[in-house]
């Protein structure tokens, strides 16, 4: 799994009018790590996880490229044709990662009103864009814009592909990011679903890095897809995941069925409770 | 007595069809899921289809996927494989075999085969 | 599909010798691993289940060990009614697999 950094930029404007405020955050490997607040940008860890392994580091140099970026996105975002009445917003994502054999992806992604318009890979410089003529329009908008006010936009699209990497790598220096493996606490739960039938649920959560393999199997065998359903895999604010999965079985079959876990090379199977005990906790042996 | 008997069997033509069947007794046949198992002659066990005991649940080997259908009746304790387009390669002895309850995908069960044949 | 390989793929041994086979997997299967006898002109018959489980009125001769990708099945004292074919196979996958088979027969 590459090590990888994610800025995520917006900017909003009314009725026309690019408002004065963004919001920046940043994930590192996945968790967030750096936020910066609409109205004044101060970067600042994200959750216990980031506390914790962050420290009393002062952000200062982040603050300033946060701040910077988000003028340059607001600026963008005033050049922008078809501004019509009410909310809109322009959000950039950029984002850069190392792979375990040491080469590099860059990439960098407009959208408009939640839609993406325009993306560009950071190491060939190549733009592509959806077929869509709203989504063509902005993006030559966009792309004349950054063409016309290459220096006024300096500070933003400069090097972006080496900045990202260089900070990355800065990260990865201070070790800011511990290769970790932290095993999941698994959670079988049962409840009522209709007559005859109840509905078995397994939870895994506490668990890092995020690929987890969760699914129901009777009598060893793993129910097909169509009868599962799967949570997704979501940050818990911890600097770790959480995720589930359900399906709805005869009631009295409940000991043919176990929840199969796998995660970083470690399995474990979890039976269903059986009778009133509703929650049953375990742990990998 | 757990007893599992395949029928049906016999000699094809390439393209051809047929549809094997079996009869399960001494068990509770709608508790238990089933496969279809062959054998070609002389070689090894090759794993063909798999249906649980709901019938929500089927899977098939690539080699037999969108040319053989498994099913069963669970009001006459049978299982069923119908086998169209039929090729040499599908030549073998059929075994249905049961799937052990609370094992790990374990046939614990089997028939004694039914011979299929396919040549011109 | 996970391809499972065996080793040997056959051998030759005397009543009372002690039997190891192995069954590899191509890719990780947990404990999803059963051993299976047959003998010829009748069908398979299982003798271990989640890789080390045995089937019950199976002779306790027979254990398996193993977890991720490497298995084996020990027989600690060949027994006359042992020479057979013994195949592993694997329900980790939807695409049930089995091995190649080893064939023990009489040195």
């Known amino acids: 799994e590459p090590h990888s950094l994610r800025y995520n930029l917006t900017v909003l404007s009314w009725d026309g009018s690019v408002q004065s405020g963004f919001l920046t955050e940043v994930h590192l490997d996945g968790q967030p790590f750096l936020r910066c607040d609409r109205q004044k940008c101060r970067a600042k860890p994200q959750g216990q996880w980031a506390e914790d392994v962050l420290g009393n580091k002062t952000w200062d140099r982040e603050t300033r490229d946060l701040t910077g970026n988000g003028k340059d996105l607001r600026m963008t975002l005033a050049h922008i044709k078809d501004q019509k009445e009410g909310l809109h917003s322009l959000q950039e994502i950029r984002v850069c990662e190392i792979h375990e054999d040491n080469s590099t992806r860059s990439s960098q992604h407009f959208y408009y009103d939640g839609e993406l318009f325009l993306s560009q890979n950071l190491e060939t410089k190549e733009w592509t864009m959806p077929q869509s003529s709203r989504a063509q329009t902005l993006a030559m908008n966009v792309r004349n814009f950054l063409k016309e006010d290459a220096m006024k936009t300096k500070t933003h699209y400069h090097a972006m592909h080496a900045d990202c990497l260089q900070e990355l790598r800065r990260y990865l220096k201070s070790g800011v990011v511990l290769r970790r493996t932290v095993p999941p606490m698994v959670n079988v739960t049962r409840s009522e679903a209709s007559e005859g039938n109840i509905t078995v649920t397994c939870r895994a959560s506490g668990f890092y890095p995020w690929n987890i393999t969760l699914s129901w199997r009777q009598d060893g065998v793993s129910l097909s897809h169509d009868t599962q359903q799967w949570g997704d895999v979501l940050p818990d604010g911890n600097g770790t995941y959480q995720t589930w999965v359900a399906t709805r079985i005869c009631q009295g079959e409940e000991q043919r069925f176990t929840c199969y876990m796998e995660h970083s090379g470690n399995h474990s199977t979890h039976p269903v409770p059986s009778g009133k005990v509703l929650v049953l906790q375990s742990h990998w042996q | 007595e757990v007893q599992l008997v395949e029928s049906g069997g016999g000699l094809v033509q390439p393209g051809g069809s047929l549809r094997l069947s079996c009869a399960a007794s001494?068990?509770?046949?709608?508790?238990?899921?089933m496969n279809w198992v062959r054998q070609a002659p002389g070689k090894g066990l090759e794993w063909v289809s798999y249906?649980?005991?709901?019938?929500?649940?089927?899977y098939y080997a690539d080699s037999v996927k969108g040319r053989f259908t498994i099913s069963r009746d669970n009001a006459k304790n049978s299982l069923y494989l119908q086998m169209n387009s039929l090729r040499d390669e599908d030549t073998a002895l059929y075994y249905c075999?049961?799937?052990?309850?609370?094992?790990?995908?374990?046939?614990?069960?089997w028939g004694q085969g039914t011979l299929v044949t396919v040549s011109s | 599909d996970i391809q499972m390989t065996q080793s040997p793929p056959s051998l030759s041994a005397s009543v009372g010798d002690r039997v190891t086979i192995t069954c590899r997997a191509s890719?990780?299967?947990?404990?999803?691993l059963n051993w299976y006898q047959q003998k010829p002109g009748k069908a398979p018959k299982v003798l271990i289940y989640g890789a080390f489980s045995l089937q019950s009125g199976v002779p306790s001769r027979f254990s398996g060990s193993g977890s991720g990708t490497d298995f084996t099945l020990t027989i600690s004292s060949l027994q006359p009614e042992d020479f057979a074919t013994y195949y592993c196979q694997q329900s980790y996958s939807t695409r049930f697999t089995f091995g190649p088979g080893t064939k023990v027969d009489i040195k």
């Open positions: 249906i649980n005991y709901s019938e929500n649940t089927i």
């Open positions: 890719q990780s299967i947990s404990s999803y």
């Open positions: 001494g068990f509770t046949f709608s508790s238990y899921s």
């Open positions: 075999a049961r799937v052990m309850v609370r094992g790990t995908g374990t046939f614990d069960y």
